[in-house]
Interface confidence: low
Amino acid sequence: AEGPAAAAAAAAAAAAAGVGGERSSRPAPSVAPEPDGCPVCVWRQHSRELRLESIKSQILSKLRLKEAPNISREVVKQLLPKAPPLQQILDLHDFQGDALQPEDFLEEDEYHATTETVISMAQETDPAVQTDGSPLCCHFHFSPKVMFTKVLKAQLWVYLRPVPRPATVYLQILRLKPLTGEGTAGGGGGGRRHIRIRSLKIELHSRSGHWQSIDFKQVLHSWFRQPQSNWGIEINAFDPSGTDLAVTSLGPGAEGLHPFMELRVLENTKRSRR
């Protein structure tokens, strides 16, 4: 997890939640400035700083970094996926390194619902679902924290390579599962390698590539109910000649173009005044 990707993750430390490439962010509500000489306020501020330091050190430890890199907004924008929702998130937060806005504090026993945007980056699949090292993409990891939230929206984002002329592209998403026994045509029997969960016809006209979003809420619900069923997915987008236009290589050369999952979740948090 070292190198530019780690640097980007570290730069997004304030927005990090969970592990395995999953990142979340929420716009922090603004609060009125505390009056001077307020002991509780001083304690809150100190407590907040301690928590932040703890979170930062956990993230840095996970990323195997000694210290947070000094990284600008522009660098972050270059390193994170070059996709519409992430650009919007960065703009929304006016991302400035690890700068944080104050948290809100609520009255005792008040229930407070907040929405978060969670980004889960594609990772390599488990060898159990691979045949001769394929498919390597894509597995999406979700932390228990996220799995216990209510999913309001879930979208898979896939980058399609540019086409020289307008073309009809057929995108399919296959749910992976480990190979068992002998496979059969049509996917029957114990050897069913993957099950198509989405197919989509897309008219491509772009000479500059295209970010395609696919509704994934239903699949996410099923994964969250049965996490053991999440072995990942395979993504293909074939043009009429059989060329796969979906960028699914997780290696170098496709930085910022990897598939990722965008979740909008509702977190019911019960907080009490300390």
Partner: antibody, heavy 123, light 107 residues
Framework: QVQLVQSGGGVVQPGRSLRLSCAAS????????MHWVRQAPGKGLEWVAV????????YYADSVKGRFTISRDNSKNTLYLQMNSLRAEDTAVYYC????????????????WGQGTLVTVSS | EIVMTQSPATLSLSAGERATLSCRAS??????LAWYQQKPGQAPRLLIY???NRATGIPARFSGSGSGTDFTLTISSLEPEDFAVYYC?????????FGGGTNVEIK
């Protein structure tokens, strides 16, 4: 334009053999699973066999298992069906068909189809 | 294997009329169903895949619906070139199987 041109049909005696060919053009043949489907005179369609894009996997209908062999030569963009121990009930028009999706032969429909070739098994 | 049953076997209609063809699976195939059109002496042609998606170049008068075990192909207003045999095919389970066909003929 995607095209499948078939050849090799004819009249053959029961117990004998015949090989059908299907020449593909207009698409990356080596990326697609390919199928054979047959239609007895005046009857409906019956799926016969499928081969994966790289020739590593073949699957057959129970009615032809052990007698028919599907194969492909990706260097020649050609699909084959070797039919041995032919029976009268094998009499049909045989169609080759391109799997709609690239890759493995699973959950598929067919598009396009070859023009068909008639195989008549009669003594 | 999954048995596909089409009804009616023959449908006698006039040009301009609406045609409703039915296909039933012996067990659920989710939405893994395709429809084909076949004219005499010709190979089948794909019309609909995944139960409701029109294939490229297929006119909007053709539409598919259904999920699980019951499926319908509707031709909103029959054109002279639509008189043909129509087959459904499931690809939810091996082996891939076809219905017996519905012959849409001119009344």
């Amino acid at each position: 334009q995607v095209q499948l041109v078939q050849s090799g049909g004819g009249v053959v005696q029961p117990g004998r053999s015949l090989r059908l060919s299907c020449a593909a053009s207009g698409f990356t043949f080596s990326s697609y699973a390919m199928h054979w489907v047959r239609q007895a005179p005046g009857k409906g369609l019956e799926w016969v066999a499928v081969i994966s894009y790289d020739g590593s996997n073949e699957y057959y209908a129970d009615s032809v298992k052990g007698r028919f062999t599907i194969s492909r030569d990706n260097s020649k963009n050609t699909l084959y069906l070797q039919m041995n121990s032919l029976r009268a009930e094998d009499t049909a028009v045989y169609y080759c068909a391109k799997d709609f999706w690239s890759g493995y032969p699973q959950y598929n429909w067919f598009d396009p189809w070859g023009q068909g070739t008639l195989v008549t098994v009669s003594s | 294997e999954i048995v596909m049953t089409q009804s009616p076997a023959t449908l006698s209609l006039s040009a301009g009329e609406r045609a409703t063809l039915s296909c039933r699976a012996s067990q659920s195939v989710s939405n893994y169903l395709a429809w084909y059109q076949q004219k005499p002496g010709q190979a089948p042609r794909l019309l609909i895949y995944d139960a409701s998606n029109r294939a490229t170049g297929i006119p909007a008068r053709f539409s598919g619906s259904g999920s699980g075990t019951d499926f319908t192909l509707t031709i909103s207003s029959l054109e002279p070139e639509d008189f043909a045999v129509y087959y459904c095919q499931q690809y939810g389970s091996a082996p891939l199987t076809f219905g017996g066909g519905t012959n849409v003929e001119i009344k």
